[in-house]
Interface confidence: low
């Protein structure tokens, strides 16, 4: 008789696998395996140029895990193409699409440029790539746009060779001219689209009280209602300025709370190369423009220019040597110019004018001095005008420039005052310009 | 401050159109993602579309594709929802609410932070 | 969709009490839960973000608690202003979708 045996019976569990993963359009799926089962997992990566959606929602990144009862615990995600979106705009500029009508997807191409005549790009070429990352990208790197800077030294006159003693500008002749009333008229130069150029002391006595400045540019006549208004934001006098002890230092920068517009009434001066001096030697012609006082003692209505030719720095320390200047009062950090004969100068109310030279290589003109001082009598044979010899403060100029931003920030609050003061009380006998 | 105030409700037929606009302030609002939220007379509340801080992407429940435009103007603070094809079931407040994007767990996912006080759309003839 | 089912529908309770609501999702939504509080005639509010998140502003009472399916939010003592409708929202999927509210009333 056999015997009897229990029942012999084997358990199995096999985990109940998940469907399986196919990677989305423009992405790869790892690990590949044949199967996946509980605890298993995968990850989507996109292609360079995709980006992972869950719906319409960016990750960062995906991993889906197979779950107990057979089903994934998140939905596939998919991978869409990147998308800069729309290109920042380009102040003075504009952006053209050369891909295609606003397509803004990996790889299009879009061209920045500026308006010519007036505006020049600066940092790059202006063409940028969409890239992977998301960003407009220049081939040099830069996610920022270019900058179209103002081109400088434009004038529709053309070089004199041969204000007092001088004869009237015509529109666009001094496009970087600014008028500046306040205390009293002044003048100024225009640098980039948002600084002015102009004289330590013109300014001096408004220094707490910048935002009453009233800064009009390409005006011709004084008096006319044709002008761009402009107001100050800040106001930047050199610390080694010391207001009443000479005319060391005279010089100062005023910040506009807004970019203006350029155009040909309105241009800003250059400032001088490395090079500039040797188109400012002895004898070199330089030209000042204002609506100083003219021969006949009044302020002028028409702005006003005269050519006036450098004068050797020795010679001219020499003339205000004599009684009844004292001497010293001409420094390294100024220079002059004017006839020996007398009867071409700059004069008061000329102040912070600048005194502009035509650069021959660039064609473009450069401010190489700053309306200052000079004798008690404008024009007065043996004497000359003094300037601030601007190319002794290219690094102070650029540091403020660089440190104090070049945009307007546009916003309101009273405009600030920035300087280092060291006053002292002293006795002048110079007549401020 | 933030504040968030809508404008445009009112009634109107069905088949017609309305714009409802929200101003804000007293936050950077071209920062946050921004979404119109709405609730029928006594019942709960429907998330309706939503609009990337730039512009650039928009969303909406299915309900309401192709007859519903969320958009917005950030030189003007401004948010919108232009709605065409109203039907009566549009009928509800239509609130307009900040949505502010947070990664969790590897996706990105919003919430609404700050509402405005609402606008009634009335949808009947 | 993810539907969202909170419970109970209403809550009746006296101040000082706890009170205790549930939201249940359809399917897991991790701790993408968010809960607001709305009275009558004014537009919701942001209590608990992502499940136990607080918010800043928000009185310490109101705590949040769940993953996955299931999810809590605690009054651990009423005040007066407490009583109000509140509703859960989940952002797991990129369709927002909110709960049908619990509205919580004086006993």
């Known amino acids: 008789m056999a015997s009897m045996t229990g029942w012999k019976i084997h358990y199995t569990s096999t985990a109940q696998p998940c469907p399986y993963p196919m990677a989305p359009p423009n992405g790869h799926l790892s690990p590949v395996q044949a199967k996946y089962i509980l605890k298993d997992s995968f990850s989507i990566f996109c292609e360079p140029g995709y980006e992972l959606l869950q719906g319409h929602l960016p990750l960062k990144s995906f991993a889906a895990v197979c779950q107990k009862d057979g089903s994934w615990d998140q939905p596939m995600p998919s991978c869409s193409i990147v998308d800069c979106g729309p290109p920042d705009d380009l102040p003075s500029g504009r952006v053209e699409y050369i891909t295609g009508p606003e397509v803004t997807t990996y790889k299009a191409v879009i061209q920045y440029s500026c308006e010519e005549t007036f505006y020049t790009m600066k940092v790059n070429d202006g063409k940028y790539v969409c890239e992977a990352d998301g960003f407009w990208t220049s081939s040099k790197g830069e996610r920022s746009p270019p900058v179209c800077e103002p081109v400088c030294g434009l004038s529709a006159r053309t070089t004199g060779g041969r204000i007092y003693g001088g004869q009237k500008a015509k529109p666009g002749d001094f496009p970087w001219q600014v008028l500046i009333l306040g205390g009293s008229t002044a003048a100024g130069a225009l640098l980039y689209d948002n600084w002015v150029l102009t004289a330590a002391h013109a300014i001096y006595e408004q220094k707490h009280d910048a935002s009453s400045l009233d800064i009009r540019l390409g005006a011709l006549k004084r008096l006319s209602p044709h002008y761009t208004q402009a107001w100050a934001e800040a106001v930047f006098i050199h610390e080694g300025y010391t207001h009443d002890a000479g005319f060391d230092n005279d010089i100062a920068l005023i910040k506009l709370n807004n970019k203006v517009v350029i155009n040909s009434n309105i241009t800003p001066i250059c400032l001088p190369r490395k090079e500039a001096e040797s188109f400012m030697r002895t004898d070199d012609i330089g030209t000042a423009s204002g609506w100083g006082l003219t021969q006949r003692g009044l302020l002028a209505r028409n702005l006003m220019y005269v050519d006036i030719p450098i004068v050797d720095h020795q010679k001219c320390t020499a003339a205000y040597e004599k009684p009844p200047y004292s001497g010293g009062s001409v420094t390294a950090n100024m220079l002059c110019a004017g006839l020996e004969s007398g009867g071409k100068d700059s004069c008061r109310g000329d102040s912070g004018g600048a005194l502009v030279f035509l650069d021959n290589e660039t064609q473009r003109w450069f401010v190489g001095g700053i309306v200052s001082w000079g004798s008690m009598n404008c024009g007065e044979a043996g004497q000359y005008g003094v300037y601030t010899k601007v190319i002794n403060y290219i690094p102070w100029i650029k540091n403020i420039i660089s440190n104090f931003g070049g945009g307007g920030s546009g916003g309101g609050g009273s405009a600030k005052f920035v300087a280092a003061w060291t006053l002292k009380a002293a006795a002048h006998h110079h007549h401020h310009h | 401050e933030v504040q968030l105030v809508e404008s445009g409700g009112g009634l109107v037929q069905p088949g017609g159109s309305l714009r409802l606009s929200c101003a804000a302030s007293?936050?950077?609002?071209?920062?946050?993602?921004m979404a119109w939220v709405r609730q029928a007379p006594g019942k709960g509340l429907e998330w309706v579309a939503t609009?990337?801080?730039?512009?650039?992407?928009?969303y909406y429940r299915d309900s309401v594709k192709g007859r519903f435009t969320i958009s917005r103007d950030n030189a003007k603070n401004s948010l919108y929802l232009q709605m065409n094809s109203l039907r009566a079931e549009d009928t509800a407040v239509y609130y307009c609410?900040?949505?502010?994007?947070?990664?969790?767990?590897?996706?990105?996912?919003?919430?609404?932070?700050?509402w405005g006080q609402g606008t009634l759309v009335t949808v009947s003839s | 969709e993810i539907v969202l089912t909170q419970s109970p529908a209403t809550l009746s309770l006296s101040p000082g009490e706890r009170a205790t609501l549930s939201c249940r999702a359809s399917?897991?939504?991790?701790?993408?839960i968010h809960w607001y509080q709305q009275k009558p005639g004014q537009a919701p509010r942001l209590l608990i973000k992502?499940?136990?998140r607080s918010i800043s502003g928000i009185p310490a009472r109101f705590s949040g608690s769940g993953s996955g399916t299931d999810f809590t939010l605690t009054i651990s003592s009423l005040e007066p202003e407490d009583f109000a409708v509140y509703y859960c929202?989940?952002?797991?999927?990129?369709?927002?979708?909110f709960g049908q509210g619990t509205k919580l009333e004086i006993k």
């Open positions: 399917q897991s939504v991790s701790t993408s």
């Open positions: 929202q989940q952002s797991y999927s990129s369709l927002y979708t």
């Open positions: 609410s900040t949505e502010s994007p947070y990664y969790s767990e590897g996706y990105y996912q919003g919430y609404f932070d700050y």
């Open positions: 007293g936050f950077t609002f071209n920062d946050y993602n």
């Open positions: 992502y499940a136990s």
């Open positions: 609009i990337l801080f730039d512009g650039s992407r928009t």
